[in-house]
């Protein structure tokens, strides 16, 4: 017996109520591939979600987050509250980055400043809660008569604290 369902295009479903005849997906549902036996319910972008792309008979709706939130997870499955630069989101809300750490985005965690000395360099611009340090030339490069050739970077030693 031929599988008549394989003839049903995207946007339809193979209607077992009537001998595998193709029927259009009902409103607010979709089938993104041919040969489907059911249509999937369209995603609804409610609450902290807003619609980026409307659902059609062949593709699901796509959501974004409303202002003050950002997407997390595949296909924006969650919305997480934004914080200010220089902050990170904790269970108790947005908290300033601890000294020696920074966050230059509205999302994510505070990260340690770069340890310039690990690369044999010196701190050119100090770090803040919002910005990483800027590393400059090594102290040796700044001394009079120093060779223009860059010396090899010293081996990394554990335990160096941020500059």
């Amino acid at each position: 017996l031929q599988d008549l369902c394989s003839n049903c295009p995207a946007g339809t479903f193979c209607d077992n109520n009537r001998s595998q005849i193709c029927s259009p997906c009902p409103p607010n549902s979709f089938s993104s591939a041919g040969g489907q036996r059911t249509c999937d319910i369209c995603r609804q972008c409610k609450g902290v979600f807003k619609t980026r792309k409307e659902c059609s008979s062949t593709s699901n709706a796509e959501c974004d987050c409303i202002s003050g939130y950002h997407c997390l997870g595949a296909e924006c499955s969650m919305c997480e509250q934004d914080c200010k630069q220089g902050q990170e989101l904790t269970k108790k809300g947005c908290k300033d980055c601890c000294f020696g750490t920074f966050n230059d985005q509205k999302r994510g965690i505070c990260r340690p400043w770069t340890n310039c000395s690990l690369d044999g360099k010196s701190v050119l611009v100090n770090g803040t809660k919002e910005r990483d340090v800027v590393c400059g030339p090594s102290p040796a490069d700044l001394s009079p008569g120093a060779s223009s050739a860059t010396p090899p970077a010293p081996a990394r030693e554990p335990g160096h604290s941020p500059q």
Epitope: P9, S23, P24, P27, S29
Partner: antibody
Framework: QVQLQESGPGLVKPSETLSLTCTVS????????WSWIRQPPGKGLEWIGR???????NYNPSLKSRVTMSVDTSKNQFSLKLSSVTAADTAVYYC?????????????????WGQGTTVTVSS | EIVMTQSPATLSLTPGERATLSCRAS???????LSWFQQIPGQAPRLLIY???TRATGIPARFSGSGSGTDFTLTISSLQPEDFAVYYC?????????FGQGTKVEIK
């Protein structure tokens, strides 16, 4: 609300191809099947076939060898071509929205029809 | 294909009378996919009943449908002058969709 309007030549010569277009207004052609039905003078209704917005078709076996349907979603139109016509193809030709389900899977029949266009096959 | 047979071919009645139209399918049809249409001369068919018994939008309550399996009935409880027309049953349970040959309701 959705409205349908058939258009095309009212007179076609025998052995030639009948071509009709149905224009959908007041709604989108997308997400539905669309049917063609004809009615010879003084006779009953005959279903010719249907087309989905992707171009997928089902034809009445009695006409299948002569029928071609197509769809132009950009113009909100679908079309019927019937080749090698004879006097027996003289009829009023109607386009209609084919049956569909609502969100609760209640099924609706052919609920919207065009007013019909008369096609006469004669030399 | 499913053959739909309507009876009688013609029904001669006076306004105010009850009209009972029959439709028989050559094989069982799920009632969800049985429709009735009204056609006034010179006009396109109009959907009256879908799902064998549900009135379409704007259809007066004097029209009712019933039946299941192979036997279906359209009833007009009290004929109005505008009801004299041809009535067709139609199935879209199995391809190809098919119509009955029609019942003409005429003024006696």
């Amino acid at each position: 609300q959705v409205q349908l309007q058939e258009s095309g030549p009212g007179l076609v010569k025998p052995s030639e191809t009948l071509s009709l277009t149905c224009t959908v207004s007041g709604g989108s052609i997308s997400s539905y099947y669309w049917s063609w039905i004809r009615q010879p003078p003084g006779k009953g209704l005959e279903w010719i076939g249907r087309i989905y917005t992707s171009g997928s078709t089902n034809y009445n076996p009695s006409l299948k060898s002569r029928v071609t349907m197509s769809v132009d979603t950009s113009k909100n139109q679908f079309s019927l071509k019937l080749s090698s016509v004879t006097a027996a193809d003289t009829a009023v030709y109607y386009c209609a929205r084919d049956g569909w389900y609502d969100e609760d899977y209640n099924y609706y029949g052919m609920d919207v029809w065009g007013q019909g266009t008369t096609v006469t096959v004669s030399s | 294909e499913i053959v739909m047979t309507q009876s009688p071919a013609t029904l001669s009645l006076t306004p105010g009378e009850r009209a009972t139209l029959s439709c028989r399918a050559s094989q069982s049809v799920s009632s969800n996919y049985l429709s009735w249409f009204q056609q006034i001369p010179g006009q396109a068919p109009r959907l009256l009943i879908y799902g064998a018994s549900t009135r379409a939008t704007g259809i007066p309550a004097r029209f009712s449908g019933s039946g299941s399996g192979t036997d279906f009935t359209l009833t007009i409880s009290s004929l109005q002058p505008e009801d004299f027309a041809v009535y067709y049953c139609q199935q879209d349970y199995d391809l190809p969709w098919t119509f009955g040959q029609g019942t003409k309701v005429e003024i006696k």
